[in-house]
Interface confidence: medium
């Protein structure tokens, strides 16, 4: 066995093992997505998190899982069976993924102001229509999760929520905000978190009430809601995690480049090995 053959053999099994790992990972992601879709309540109790945007994540996880499994399967079978067409397809898929990421990166860096404004518009629309439309629960859950995780409330200010007519205080009643705005660590008073499910929400039936984010909390006189708007919160989060984000993106990009290089190298050199082997037969 020549050095080239052993090198190709090493690449072949390296690609197979790594893609097998990604196939298993993809199937796990897919299973989680399906689990959330089928049984949300058991997943929430398993994860133990409040305000998880399950509706979006179930679909995102399921699609990502299938996509990861698909690419990994191409790499696995293509490498193990030494099938040029599958390895070529594997390379093509990775190239497409890599090109998409590069394009996204360029778009994000050049169109930052427009993206920020688009995000603000989406958030404003979500806030304005909060709790009134059963079809909008995915966006609402996601925004609740952002508020909960970033410890912020509203876009510019918590008062953004007071623009929503169904959340406005009436007479002696306090204004209301989603419970994801509450700073649970700032208060020991459990009465503050007595939920106020609005009549408008109750008309939506179990669909609205079953999800955590439809819970509306009254703002007490000395409020325990997050004081910071999420625009500042997001900026802080991006600033604090910029190195990590760039690192992960670079890591994923380099990993893709590595697999692309190996797959195309294996694909191009399979012919030479077959030709050499044919002479010995």
């Amino acid at each position: 066995m020549s050095a080239q053959e052993s090198c190709l053999s090493l690449i072949k099994y390296f690609l197979f093992v790594f893609n097998l790992f990604f196939f298993v990972l993809g199937s796990l992601i897919f299973c989680f997505g399906i689990w959330i879709l089928i049984d949300k309540t058991s997943f929430v109790s398993f994860v133990g998190l409040a305000f998880v945007p399950l509706q979006i994540w179930s679909k995102v996880l399921a699609i990502s899982g299938i996509f990861t499994m698909g690419i990994a399967l191409l790499g696995c079978v293509g490498a193990l069976k030494e099938l040029r067409c599958l390895l070529g397809l594997y390379f093509g898929m990775l190239l497409l993924l890599f090109a998409t990421q590069i394009t996204l990166g360029i778009l994000i860096s050049t169109q930052r102001a427009q993206l920020e404004r688009s995000l603000r518009d989406v958030v404003e629309k979500t806030i304005q229509k909060y709790g009134t439309n059963p079809e909008e629960t995915a966006a609402e859950e996601s925004w609740d999760y952002v508020q909960f995780q970033l410890r912020c409330c509203g876009w510019h200010y918590p008062q953004d929520w007071f623009q929503v007519l169904i959340l406005r205080g009436n007479g002696s009643e306090a204004h209301r905000v989603p419970c994801s705005c509450y700073n649970l660590s700032a208060t020991n008073d459990s009465t503050i978190l007595d939920k106020v499910i609005l009549p408008q929400l109750s008309r939506l039936g179990h669909l609205a009430r079953s999800r955590h984010s439809a819970d509306i909390c009254a703002v007490p006189a000395e409020s325990h809601i997050y004081r910071e708007g999420c625009a500042q919160g997001l900026q802080k989060w991006l600033h604090n995690n910029l190195i990590s984000i760039v690192g992960i993106c670079l890591g994923v990009g380099l990993l893709e480049l590595g697999f692309m290089t190996l797959s195309i190298f294996l694909c191009r050199n399979l012919d030479h090995v077959y030709n050499r082997l044919a002479r010995y037969r």
């Epitope: 876009w155 200010y157 953004d160 007519l165 306090a174 204004h175």
Partner: antibody
Framework: QVQLVQSGAEVVKPGASVKVSCKAS????????MYWVKQAPGQRLEWMGY????????TYNQKFKGRVTITRDTSASTAYMELSSLRSEDTAVYYC????????????WGQGTLVTVSS | DIQMTQSPSSLSASVGDRVTITCKAS??????VDWYQQKPGKAPKLLIN???TRHTGVPSRFSGSGSGTDYTLTISSMQPEDFATYYC?????????FGQGTKLEIK
């Protein structure tokens, strides 16, 4: 920190126009609307209109419509208010103030620009 | 246009006094009311928005309440720096309108 710095005092003749500027700093200029408010001596505050610096959309008080024009220069983070066909009752202090949305409070104000209409 | 009528137009008070300023709208403005403080030669300063929410950095002695057409600004214990003119404003519908102001003077 957030700052709104307005141009200096102006003395103009009746029938002429005046353009007051308001330079914003310490925040993302396109993220907040810019209001213009008039305060004539001994009078209540009067809302003139506002601009959304992101797209240039304007909303005016009908009372000033046709005479007031609000514009912006995003590259300079500056909003402008031009008032034409000036008359003596336009003698006032003009304030710019930022607001996150149209229907919202004005959380930061400029120092004001005194415009005196006198022949 | 929605008219905002403030009362009283002027008021004399002493340091430590509890002061209440009222603002009546000509129609329901659904808590879309702000309160501003203005000192001579200075720009107005936001105190309260959405009828009852204190703006960042505003002392807790200032409080707002009300709904429908009637709104109040209360200063629980007057301080020397609180002597100024106070304005209410509705941002429920355009044109946004201000009250005529309440001038707080030292007794």
């Amino acid at each position: 920190q957030v700052q709104l710095v307005q141009s200096g005092a102006e003395v103009v003749k009746p029938g002429a126009s005046v353009k007051v500027s308001c330079k914003a700093s310490g925040y993302s200029f396109t993220d907040y609307n810019m209001y213009w408010v008039k305060q004539a001596p001994g009078q209540r505050l009067e809302w003139m209109g506002y601009i959304d610096p992101y797209n240039g959309d304007t909303t005016y008080n009908q009372k000033f419509k046709g005479r007031v024009t609000i514009t912006r220069d995003t590259s300079a983070s500056t909003a402008y208010m031009e008032l034409s066909s000036l008359r003596s009752e336009d003698t006032a202090v003009y304030y710019c103030a930022r607001s996150p949305y149209g229907h919202y409070a004005m959380d930061y104000w400029g120092q004001g620009t005194l415009v005196t209409v006198s022949s | 246009d929605i008219q905002m009528t403030q009362s009283p137009s002027s008021l004399s008070a002493s340091v430590g006094d509890r002061v209440t300023i009222t603002c009546k709208a000509s129609q329901d403005v659904s808590t879309a009311v702000d309160w501003y403080q203005q000192k001579p030669g200075k720009a107005p300063k936001l105190l309260i928005n959405w009828a009852s929410t204190r703006h960042t950095g505003v002392p807790s002695r200032f409080s707002g309440s009300g709904s429908g057409t009637d709104y109040t600004l209360t200063i629980s214990s007057m301080q020397p720096e609180d002597f100024a003119t106070y304005y209410c404003r509705q941002h429920y519908s355009t044109p946004f309108t201000f009250g005529q102001g309440t001038k707080l003077e030292i007794k």
